[in-house]
């Protein structure tokens, strides 16, 4: 029928090194027409699905998976895959989420700007996605 589905990509906002207790959003991207994204842990035994899919660019769709407050249990390797026209894609590359204090001195408070308002707005007129803050997204318990 059609050729192989494009491989999804995976990224994290604000980054892949997150201090404990802070939020992180894992972003999965694929082509337009993706029905469902799945975020998996490395052993495949734990995953989270969403059908809340929207525009990332004229040629891409995306889904966002938020962990409100990361802990050591959230550290590890994540990857995405998706369903389009009843077919599963290949997996994305692995994303390595590291949970640790980002300042050199772990006794001092974290001084980076608070990212709890959600992901940074991308420059574009944006989608019906509109990158609304996801401040009540998936907690660690919900995800895994």
């Amino acid at each position: 029928q059609e050729g192989p589905l494009p491989r999804p990509s995976i990224s994290a906002e604000p980054g892949t090194v997150i201090p404990p207790g802070r939020p992180v959003t894992i972003v999965c991207r694929g082509p337009v027409g993706v029905d469902q994204f799945r975020l998996e842990r490395e052993d495949r035994s734990k995953f989270n699905d969403t059908k809340d899919v929207s525009q990332a660019s004229p040629s891409e769709s995306e889904a966002r998976f938020r962990i409100d407050s990361v802990s050591e249990g959230n550290a590890g390797h994540y990857r995405c895959l998706y369903v389009k026209s009843t077919r599963w894609s290949e997996h994305s590359d692995y994303l390595d989420l590291v949970v640790k204090e980002t300042s050199g001195d772990t006794d001092s408070p974290v001084t980076e700007p608070d990212s709890s308002a959600g992901p940074t707005q991308r420059p574009s007129d944006n989608s019906h996605n509109e990158h609304a803050p996801a401040s009540q997204g998936l907690s660690a318990e919900h995800l895994y």
């Epitope: 337009v32 027409g33 699905d49 969403t50 059908k51 525009q55 938020r66 959600g118 997204g137």
Partner: antibody, heavy 119, light 107 residues
Framework: EVQLVESGGGLVQPGGSLRLSCAAS????????MNWVRQAPGKGLEWVAR??????????FYADSVKDRFTISRDDSKNSLYLQMNSLKTEDTAVYYC??????????WGQGTTVTVSS | DIQMTQSPSSLSASVGDRVTITCLAS??????LGWYQQKPGKAPKLLIY???SLAEGVPSRFSGSGSGTDFTLTISSLQPEDFATYYC?????????FGGGTKVEIK
């Protein structure tokens, strides 16, 4: 089988209020974005409002024509979508459809509920 | 806001005819375009999503093409059940706008 059943339509005077409901079944409601679309008598389709999932903090979006008058909400525990309509105008007279996304597109529609705004 | 201009607004055709409906977006929307069919007194039905993908259960005589700003819905051989109104919709940015519709009538 996906089912979306709207209710709450009726006759209301200009300036009045109505609350539409949509009962969803046959799919996992809480992982889907949901929408309201309307169609005035003899006219085309008009998107009204959209609500996203918990992953997006239930973000809401509205057509300019209903902004500040209509409120979309959802109750995932009840598999239900709502549209609170205040300060109704005669031009809000339409059939209102509850619509579920698939792949970001409007794949599943309810049968519609009729709202008539008239004095 | 992105305007969607559909043409023609109506057309008359016979069973077996090839029918083409076009939709023009006022700015680029990539392939974030859907086509819907609506019959009188019924809810719309998704025919094509992502500009070219056939929705579940839709006959293969329906096809979509285009990307960017220019899109086409084609019915390769019109059947009696295809007489209806067709709408395009952009889902690239809010507000999620529809075209004005094309009514396909029996000649």
């Amino acid at each position: 089988e996906v089912q979306l059943v709207e209710s709450g339509g009726g006759l209301v005077q200009p300036g009045g209020s109505l609350r539409l409901s949509c009962a969803a079944s046959g799919f996992t409601f809480n992982i889907n974005a949901m929408n309201w679309v309307r169609q005035a008598p003899g006219k085309g389709l008009e998107w009204v409002a959209r609500i996203r999932t918990k992953n997006y903090n239930y973000a809401t979006f509205y057509a300019d024509s209903v902004k500040d008058r209509f409120t979309i909400s959802r109750d995932d525990s009840k598999n239900s979508l709502y549209l609170q309509m205040n300060s109704l105008k005669t031009e809000d007279t339409a059939v209102y459809y509850c619509v579920r996304d698939r792949a970001g597109f409007f794949a599943y529609w309810g049968q519609g509920t009729t709202v008539t705004v008239s004095s | 806001d992105i305007q969607m201009t559909q043409s023609p607004s109506s057309l008359s055709a016979s069973v077996g005819d090839r029918v083409t409906i076009t939709c023009l977006a006022s700015q680029t929307i990539g392939t974030w375009l859907g086509w819907y069919q609506q019959k009188p007194g019924k809810a719309p039905k998704l025919l094509i999503y992502a500009a070219t993908s056939l929705a579940e259960g839709v006959p293969s005589r329906f096809s979509g093409s285009g990307s960017g700003t220019d899109f086409t819905l084609t019915i390769s051989s019109l059947q009696p059940e295809d007489f209806a109104t067709y709408y395009c919709q952009q889902l690239y940015s809010t507000p999620l706008t529809f075209g004005g519709g094309t009514k396909v009538e029996i000649k």
